[in-house]
Amino acid sequence: MASMGLQVMGIALAVLGWLAVMLCCALPMWRVTAFIGSNIVTSQTIWEGLWMNCVVQSTGQMQCKVYDSLLALPQDLQAARALVIISIIVAALGVLLSVVGGKCTNCLEDESAKAKTMIVAGVVFLLAGLMVIVPVSWTAHNIIQDFYNPLVASGQKREMGASLYVGWAASGLLLLGGGLLCCNCPPRTDKPYSAKYSAARSAAASNYV
């Protein structure tokens, strides 16, 4: 079985990834548009996130507003919302499973069951990581595509915001953490034990005869 250190490392990375997904979800910096004024005082930045957009003045003053309508939002934004929320829920399930299957917890007595639970937790974290990387990469792809598209007005050309980098980091942590937990192999103590048991039983039988 993988060492406890590897297991703790896997859980720690996955939990950090889970927290990063929540941060990525909450931060309104998925797409950024900078409007440079005639002087630095009039420069402004518009941040667009999954739930709201913000206007940031050059003075640092920031005001945010939740989107007016859910129905009128683009499909990719609606899909990103759904995938990131599902990823948070799935990663939460992974955290729960990793606690249950942890070597240093007593939720399960059977070492084999613990190891299997930890592998399931690893797979769950891998799934959560994939669910984050898809919307983040798709948004980045659209931003880059629109940036070089002459049919997209300059006022609609965005840049990649900090949330996308947080999202990539989150998916990396979840995939790495999940991968480490999947390295947990079930204990191989079953076969030697059953062999001893059958041998003992046959000896008893011969004595009876």
């Epitope: 518009i46 206007v55 005001q63 009128a72 939002l73 007005a153």
Partner: antibody, heavy 121, light 106 residues
């Protein structure tokens, strides 16, 4: 360049409906919002609503929620507005516009030439 | 709804500086835009985000303000500037326009 070409003037009877069109070109229609606005000649402008051309999702000014229906045809890059149960108060110049500024922080850069709707018996 | 109050009319001589004001009933941050409309034409965007000049618009036009008080300045005014000027906010839902300020030249 961006072009928005609206349908011609309409003279309609009270209680009837009318469908206005706005044919677009020069931009990626299915990745854009389209807006509709109303102006009574000599008066101010009112925003009716926005439609996202990609999937037809709409966001209306509550005042026009039961009056206007916004639709799009992505194959012809055309936006439509249906006005129902027309009264004399609906007599106005209707503009389609292509907004910039993101999901809801809109300013209207490109405008159609306007369609004059006259409701009269 | 956010009400935008504009002075209804102004008369100035060519070459002068004119300021058109727009006051919002509640804060609109810097989401204030200005349009020029000439008779029989569609509105034309001049200023967006309170102070950003739309491309192709002469530098004679400038905008300022934030929160509830905004101004559009034309310096110097030319004969071609005879039109109605509308302010429009897009921070609060629904997006609203001012009643318009009719600019006439003496």
């Amino acid at each position: 360049q961006v072009k928005l070409l609206q349908s011609g003037a309409e003279l309609v009877k009270p209680g009837s409906s009318v469908k206005l069109s706005c044919k677009t070109s020069g931009f990626t229609f299915n990745k854009s919002y389209m807006s509709w606005l109303k102006q009574v000649p000599g008066q101010s402008i009112e925003w009716i609503g926005n439609i996202y051309a990609g999937h037809g999702g709409t966001h209306y000014n509550q005042k026009f929620k039961n009056k206007a229906t916004l639709t799009v045809d992505t194959s012809s890059s055309t936006a439509y507005m249906d006005l129902s149960s027309l009264t004399s108060e609906d007599s106005a110049l209707y503009f389609c516009a292509r907004p910039d500024g993101g999901y809801n922080l809109n300013w209207f850069v490109y405008w159609g030439q306007g369609t004059l709707v006259t409701v009269s018996s | 709804d956010t009400v935008l109050t504009q002075s209804p009319a102004l008369a100035v001589s060519p070459g002068e500086r004119v300021t058109i004001s727009c006051r919002a009933s509640e804060s609109v941050t810097t989401l204030m835009n200005w349009y020029q409309q000439k008779p029989g034409q569609q509105p034309k965007l001049l200023i967006y985000l309170a102070s950003h000049l739309e491309s192709g618009v002469p530098a004679r036009f400038s905008g300022s303000g934030s929160g509830t008080d905004f101004t559009l300045t034309i310096d110097p005014v030319e004969a071609d500037d005879t039109a109605t000027y509308y302010c429009q906010q897009s921070w609060n839902d629904p997006k609203t326009f001012g009643v318009g300020t009719k600019l006439e030249l003496k």
